[in-house]
Interface confidence: low
């Protein structure tokens, strides 16, 4: 059962796994949620009745029954992990803690004008987990305005003490605010030769990379595949670091793969969700339960529904045994990974999907696209919305994209002459405009946020956010698309599609069925040559065929230019403007979303 509220002056007795230090009970709950085994916790707040060495301790706990005896204790705050909950979870913590010194390894000291600047440095430094900043009121003159960047093995402070006139906080890498580059490539036949900070067992290099991404100290990894010559190292995932943040040496070795932590673009990749099945593979670990199941999919469901289950192995039924049901072994370990991986025994293994909610919803795989044709099918573009105006009569006005459960990203030029958000309606999960009737449910718009530098589409800043009056419940037919990562500026997108209900030619009408067209991106230099009378800025992105024929058109405005990269769809552009529609040597011009990620996050994450 999901319990979100904190229990004041209450301590859970027993079940201790480990003790960490956190600046608040709220953050202790987040740490517990992300820990592979923690189900409950007790935090000790600062209090005159409590020994100061126990202040800010966060004791992570586990229990077979999922609960523990409660004891009254002043200054203790207890609660449950969010693992038991179905709602979206985020590790992003923007809080600033006044008069607290979070202890760690001070590896970087510099002068900063403000705590915000210090936090930005921490966010953009590959090693930084948290920081402490001495304000200009700090008693010691030579330490004033000093920004200390810190890291620890666990990513949490080793101690927290009271210290007047300092402030502390965490890196905002998990808030998608880092400018660090993401190197997404996995390098085959490569070993990175640097310090190993940890090692785990993994079924493939992708899972190894995800483990590295959420491990606080891992900057890059090497994975030894099941064909690796040394048997004892097969399926071994080595988590690595270096002073420089990059591997010092690349060694050519067959049957090994290496890659990088994607911590700074983790909002647009699955990190916790290992959804694949591994055939003829057995995961070893502590056995939680053995239950009968009809299939490996059913076994995965059982594991996902058992809060303590981390991974499973399913052994199919021997002919006509047990009503055709196989054995489903539900398992766990201290770190969430199998203790050993064996091949050739006929088992089918996989991981719990319970942790998928710790990833951004936008990373969830959607149903495969229908290749060919121009009409879309239901659920193919679940982030696409149709924005209607009700004045003077109801009609489709523009497209838009779901980017959060209360947010639509669209184009600013759509709102020319729109006096009030009250006349707007957002319909999601729609394939055909004819589905929209009087009683069709819609989202009202609470607020229209237009970029304050917007003047006209052709001069840029053609971007707007709609804040919905109610939240979107994500389903297969309505879910968000990922924003591109700032660290991903060098990604070359090759699988890009424009969608909308707009005209199919310049003089036409709004289409009934959502249309799609695969369109290649065009360099800004090439695009500038085609639009000599305009300035194509880096905040714009162009797409189109040299010969024309496929393009966005009137009515598609505000809709997405969606590009698929590493199985995840990214909102690369917003349909903005162009000369005519699908004309030869006249590419469509789109708002370059990556250039507005900070603006989007500032507006959508504002308190």
């Amino acid at each position: 059962e999901c319990v979100t509220q904190l229990l004041k002056d209450t301590c859970f007795e027993g079940g201790d796994i480990t003790t960490v230090f956190t600046p608040s009970a709220k953050y202790c709950q987040v740490v517990c949620t992300y820990h592979p085994r923690c189900l409950l916790f007790t935090f000790t707040a600062e209090s005159p009745s409590e020994d100061p060495t126990r202040w800010f301790t966060c004791v992570l706990k586990d229990s077979v029954t999922e609960t523990l005896p409660r004891v009254n204790r002043t200054a203790a705050i207890s609660g449950y992990s969010f693992k038991q909950c179905s709602h979206q979870i985020s590790a992003c913590n923007k809080d600033i803690y006044v008069d607290l010194d979070m202890k760690g390894i001070n590896y970087n000291s510099s002068v900063a004008k403000s705590a915000q600047e210090c936090q930005e440095r921490c966010t953009d430094d590959v090693h930084c987990h948290f920081f402490t900043y001495a304000t200009r009121q700090f008693p010691s003159l030579e330490h004033r305005n000093i920004c200390l960047l810190k890291h620890t093995q666990t990513g949490t402070p080793t101690r927290i003490t009271k210290l007047d006139k300092v402030v502390s906080g965490f890196s905002l890498k998990s808030c998608a605010l880092s400018n660090l580059a993401c190197i997404r490539d996995i390098f085959p036949n490569t070993v990175f030769a640097d310090s190993n900070i940890d090692s785990v067992m993994a079924p493939d290099a992708f899972v190894c990379g995800r483990i590295c991404t959420h491990h606080p100290g891992c900057l890059f990894f090497t994975f030894f595949s099941q064909e690796w010559p040394k048997e004892s190292q097969r399926n071994l995932c080595l988590l690595k670091t270096s002073e420089s943040g990059l591997p010092s040496t690349r060694i050519k070795k067959s049957k090994a793969l290496s890659g990088f932590s994607l911590q700074s673009c983790r909002h647009s990749i699955p990190v916790f969700c290992h959804s694949s099945f591994y055939h003829d593979t057995d995961f070893l670990g502590e056995e939680l339960d053995i239950v009968a199941a009809k299939s490996h999919e059913a076994c995965q469901k059982l594991c996902t529904n058992a809060v303590r289950c981390q991974f499973f192995t399913y052994t199919p039924a021997q002919a006509s045994c047990n009503e055709g049901k196989g054995k489903c072994y539900l398992k766990l370990s201290s770190n969430g990974s199998p203790t050993k991986i064996l091949h050739g025994r006929g088992g089918i293994s996989g991981y719990t999907l319970r942790l998928c909610k710790m990833d951004n919803e936008c990373t969830t795989k959607i149903k495969p696209r229908i290749v060919g044709g121009t009409a879309s099918v239901r659920g193919e573009w679940p982030w696409q919305v149709t924005l209607h105006t009700t004045s003077p009569t109801q009609r489709h006005l523009c497209g838009g994209s779901i980017i959060g459960n209360q947010w639509i990203l669209t184009a600013a030029h759509c709102f020319y002459g729109v006096e009030s958000p009250k006349i707007l309606r957002v319909y999601s999960g729609i394939l055909n405009q004819s589905e929209i009737k009087e009683d069709t449910s819609f989202f009202g718009v609470q607020e229209i946020i237009i970029h304050d530098q917007y003047k006209m589409a052709e001069s840029g800043y053609d971007i707007a956010l709609l804040k919905l009056e109610t939240t979107v419940n994500y389903t297969d037919s309505q879910r968000p698309i990922c924003l591109p990562s700032k660290g991903d500026r060098n990604v070359i997108y090759t699988d890009c599609w424009v969608t909308g209900w707009g005209y199919r030619k310049l003089r036409d009408k709004i289409q009934n069925t959502l249309q799609k067209a695969k369109i290649p991106l065009v360099t800004n230099e090439e695009c500038q040559k085609r639009y000599r009378g305009h300035k194509i800025t880096h905040k714009m992105i162009c797409a189109g065929y040299r010969e024309g024929g496929k393009d966005a058109c009137k009515g598609d405005s505000g809709g997405p230019l969606s590009c698929k990269h590493n199985e995840v769809w990214h909102l690369v552009g917003i349909t903005s403007w162009g000369e005519g529609c699908a004309q030869r040597e006249r590419p469509g011009v789109y708002t370059n979303v990556v250039e507005y990620v900070d603006w989007i996050l500032e507006k959508t994450q504002a308190v």
Partner: nanobody
Amino acid sequence: QVQLVESGGGSVQAGGSLRLSCAASGYTYSMGAMAWFRQAPGKGLEGVSLIATSSGFISYTDSVKGRFTISQDNSKNTLYLQMNSLKPEDTAVYYCAAGTQFSWSPGSYNYWGQGTLVTVSS
């Protein structure tokens, strides 16, 4: 091991400019930070400017802000200190240092150059 060799020191009139260079060789990838320190006659070591080699973060001591510029050329493994509007109080032996910590403390730096003398006359 890392070897650091400074050059570019000399004598200059107040208000003049000099550019110091520090060529690094050896196990340079292990250096998280590089720094310029100086030691005036009869005084202790003073941090002048720091640069985080991987992230490019830069910091200056107050007395040189706006006059000195630290930079690096990774392709040549060289650290520079451009010194403009020099003052007599800038007279010192200037040392290049490399280490893993981005810190004003000389103790954080494992590798040091031999030093280059800068004399500023009024």
